[in-house]
């Protein structure tokens, strides 16, 4: 049997109904409707796509952003949801489809030749205009890889990971989300327990690094389950 | 259109430890879901590990959880299958293969599109 195991700075998601795939209803998939492993029968037809439960938007497809499948939902339940299109509303640019992003409240296009300006502009009303930066993080900087060609140093404004440069991940910091260094051997690390805790998160950690998962550290096993300290240890 | 060229294979004993590469070129590799796959000599392909195009994601199959890690580096457009505590019955050619990843679903439920030529891993006792 297959197991589904996500990594530590992820939730522990159930798999999809047995037989289907996760996704959205009526969502259209341009993919071939079904899985083949080459060498074998293993074929199987997707055709009712069930929500794919997620904690943050990297957990979710390009297509797709992490939120409450209601309005003013239970904070705890989050699904993987179609992104939105052009002119659709949004509240941040993770929820608008690749090649858009959130501007005012709507999705516009990431269009090149006017982008650069207009992205400066949002950060600054983001945040004010009397803050240019934030702990000494620059604000007007890489936000999406799909926008600019370079990727996001640390402190970079960015949506998702592969925003960032190598080395660094994209995680939540005050109302934004900058790249941030991925955590190393010994480096106090965040073991989520409850689904949705990501979302309370004002400074968020990253992952572990290559090779290491966050346990937790030895010397503290004895102390009570609220205080345990997580660090990135070696498989 | 994405082309997949598998390294990092050979012989080692048991116990021991390989890193395998899976470096892409072509179309955008960090919108890819990534998975490694093995075939050993007379038997189905079957599934190893995946992870999604964030990385947030991994999945395993179970007679490699805990030894097997993989992971990606996508400004380098290279995922990684880090090895370690190998056995014989690891003993098969790995192949790597990407499919798109614009819906989440269990990782061991993807339409892998493109594949690798592969890399032999032999695990002697």
């Known amino acids: 049997t297959l197991n589904s195991v996500l990594n530590s700075n992820a939730i522990k998601n159930l798999p999809p109904p047995l037989g289907g795939a996760a996704g959205h209803p009526g969502s259209a998939v341009s993919a071939a409707p079904g899985i083949l492993y080459p060498g074998g029968n293993k074929y199987q037809t997707i055709d009712n796509y069930q929500p794919y439960p997620c904690a943050e938007d990297e957990e979710c497809g390009t297509d797709e952003y992490c939120a409450s499948p209601t309005r003013g939902g239970d904070a705890g339940v989050q699904i993987c949801l179609a992104c939105r299109k052009r002119r659709k509303r949004c509240m941040r640019h993770a929820m608008c489809c690749p090649g858009n992003y959130c501007k005012n409240g709507i999705c516009v296009s990431s269009d090149q030749n006017h982008f650069r300006g207009e992205i400066e502009e949002t950060i600054t009303e983001s945040f004010g205009n009397d803050h240019s930066t934030l702990d000494g993080y620059s604000r007007r900087t890489t936000l999406s890889s799909k926008m600019y060609h370079t990727k996001g140093q640390e402190g970079s404004v960015c949506l998702r990971s592969s925003d960032c440069a190598s080395g660094l991940c994209c995680a939540r910091h005050f109302w934004s989300k900058i790249c941030k260094p991925v955590l190393k051997e010994g480096q106090v690390c965040t073991k989520h327990r409850r689904k949705g805790s990501h979302g309370l998160e004002i400074f968020q950690r990253c992952y572990c690094g290559e090779g290491l998962s966050c346990r937790i550290q030895k010397d503290h096993h004895q102390a009570s389950n609220s205080s345990r300290l997580h660090t990135c240890q070696r498989h | 259109e994405v082309q997949l060229v598998e390294s990092g294979g050979g012989l080692v004993q048991a116990g021991g430890s390989l890193r395998l590469s899976c470096t892409a070129s072509?179309?955008?590799?960090?919108?890819?879901?990534v998975g490694w796959f093995r075939q050993a000599p007379g038997k189905e392909r079957d599934f190893v590990t995946a992870?999604?195009?964030?990385?947030?994601?991994?999945a395993y199959a179970d007679s490699v959880k805990g030894r097997f890690t993989i992971s990606r580096d996508n400004a380098k457009n290279t995922a990684y299958l880090q090895m370690n505590s190998l056995k014989p019955e690891d003993t098969a050619v790995y192949f790597c293969?990407?499919?798109?990843?614009?819906?989440?679903?269990?990782?061991?439920?993807?339409?892998?599109?493109?594949w690798g030529q592969g890399t032999q891993v032999t695990v002697s006792s």
């Open positions: 992870i999604n195009w964030s990385g947030a994601r991994t």
């Open positions: 293969a990407a499919g798109r990843d614009r819906y989440a679903r269990d990782l061991t439920e993807y339409e892998y599109l493109w």
């Open positions: 072509g179309s955008a590799f960090s919108s890819h879901v």
